[in-house]
Interface confidence: medium
């Protein structure tokens, strides 16, 4: 079946594809990036991090995977810092264009324990 | 310890093929984007891949695609680079590294591991 | 790509002095610009990350400025231990290209 170009597309659509386990584990005092790659047609128009319904205005960043004008792939990072045992818990990503929209939630756990477990 | 330790290296023929492995400990690596760098003898730093966390996501330096395949398997905290059709021009001691933050800077380096490809 | 265009590519020094290493972008990479210290035989180690922010355990002799296509990396009083060869590696696109490398040697 022959490939369908961007601009054949009837519908738009949002695929996201988590690029770290949605489940993380991870040790107190440590850091983690969530990543997450997505396909989107039209083009995406808003894009945000939430956890506790909390918007993140800083910490993550959104771009482009390829530079070419035909590019319709993204990555979205989430980059959170020497977590601490009460910052355990959900982190959505939500992202919409004009058709559609979509999230992909991620289940932080931090380990406080003194002897640190590796995963 | 926190440390990265590769391995595999070694000397080769022209065309023939080589796996390293970058085994990691002291840290989870299956939070971390990996990458590694090459550095022929005498001369600069070239990077050469990178791999997302989860291992679902690759991107490579134009002087390797299609020869060379990065992945990892995070149940063993190892990072690895197929290395195939080798040419003596991919002579170089290669250095897996650790990926961090929103700045995308590499804070842990291994001792690097040396790969002559000759005849 | 992204060229990543280092100057001078060695220079000779004496303990005390200040040394200055500039890194030149082939486009705009804001601050995306990281700075790494190898010294012979060993693997690079992070110096400065984020243009200007100093890496954790790094002395504070060494400093980073710059943005857009422009950057420094200073060290204010040179030590025995800073002769290496300095890097810069722009982390703006996917390929994460690194300057060709200053060597600092001893005068």
């Known amino acids: 079946q022959p490939s369908v170009s961007p601009g054949e597309v009837d519908k738009g659509f949002i695929n996201i594809f988590p690029m770290i386990n949605t489940t993380v584990f991870v040790n107190d005092g440590e850091n983690v990036d969530l990543i997450v790659e997505y396909e989107a047609f039209p083009k995406p128009e808003h894009q945000q991090w939430i956890y506790m319904n909390r918007t993140f205005t800083d910490k993550w960043e959104d771009y482009p995977k390829s530079e070419n004008e035909s590019n319709i792939r993204y990555v979205s990072e989430l980059h959170l810092t020497r977590l601490k045992g009460t910052e355990g818990g959900t982190y959505t990503f939500l992202v919409s264009n004009s058709d559609v929209n979509a999230a992909i939630a991620f289940n932080v756990y931090v380990n406080t324990k003194h002897h640190h477990h590796h995963h | 310890e926190v440390q990265l330790l590769e391995s595999g290296g070694g000397l080769v023929q022209p065309g023939g093929s080589l796996r390293l492995s970058c085994a990691a400990s002291?840290?989870?690596?299956?939070?971390?984007?990996m990458i590694w760098v090459r550095q022929a003898p005498g001369k600069g730093l070239e990077w050469v891949s990178r791999?997302?966390?989860?291992?679902?996501?690759?991107d490579y330096a134009d002087s390797v695609k299609g020869r060379f395949t990065i992945s990892r398997d995070n149940s063993k905290n190892t990072l690895y680079l197929q290395m195939n059709s080798l040419r003596a021009e991919d002579t170089a001691t290669y250095y897996c590294?650790?990926?961090?933050?929103?700045?995308?800077?590499?804070?842990?380096w291994g001792r690097g591991t040396l790969v002559t490809v000759s005849s | 790509d992204i060229q990543m265009t280092q100057s001078p590519s060695s220079l000779s020094a004496s303990v005390g002095d200040r040394v200055t290493v500039t890194c030149r972008a082939s486009?705009?990479?804001?601050?995306?610009l990281n700075w790494y210290q190898q010294r012979p035989g060993k693997a690079p180690e992070l110096l400065i990350y984020?243009?200007?922010s100093l890496q954790s355990g790094v002395p504070s002799r060494f400093s980073g400025s710059g943005s857009g296509t422009d950057f420094t990396l200073t060290i204010s009083s040179l030590q025995p231990e800073d002769f290496a060869t300095y890097y810069c590696?722009?982390?703006?696109?996917?390929?994460?290209?690194f300057g060709q490398g200053t060597k600092v040697e001893i005068k």
């Open positions: 590294a650790r990926r961090v933050g929103a700045s995308r800077y590499f804070d842990l």
């Open positions: 002291g840290f989870t690596f299956s939070n971390y984007t």
């Open positions: 791999i997302w966390p989860s291992g679902g996501g690759t």
């Open positions: 486009q705009n990479i804001d601050n995306y």
């Open positions: 984020a243009a200007s």
């Open positions: 590696q722009q982390s703006y696109s996917n390929s994460r290209t």
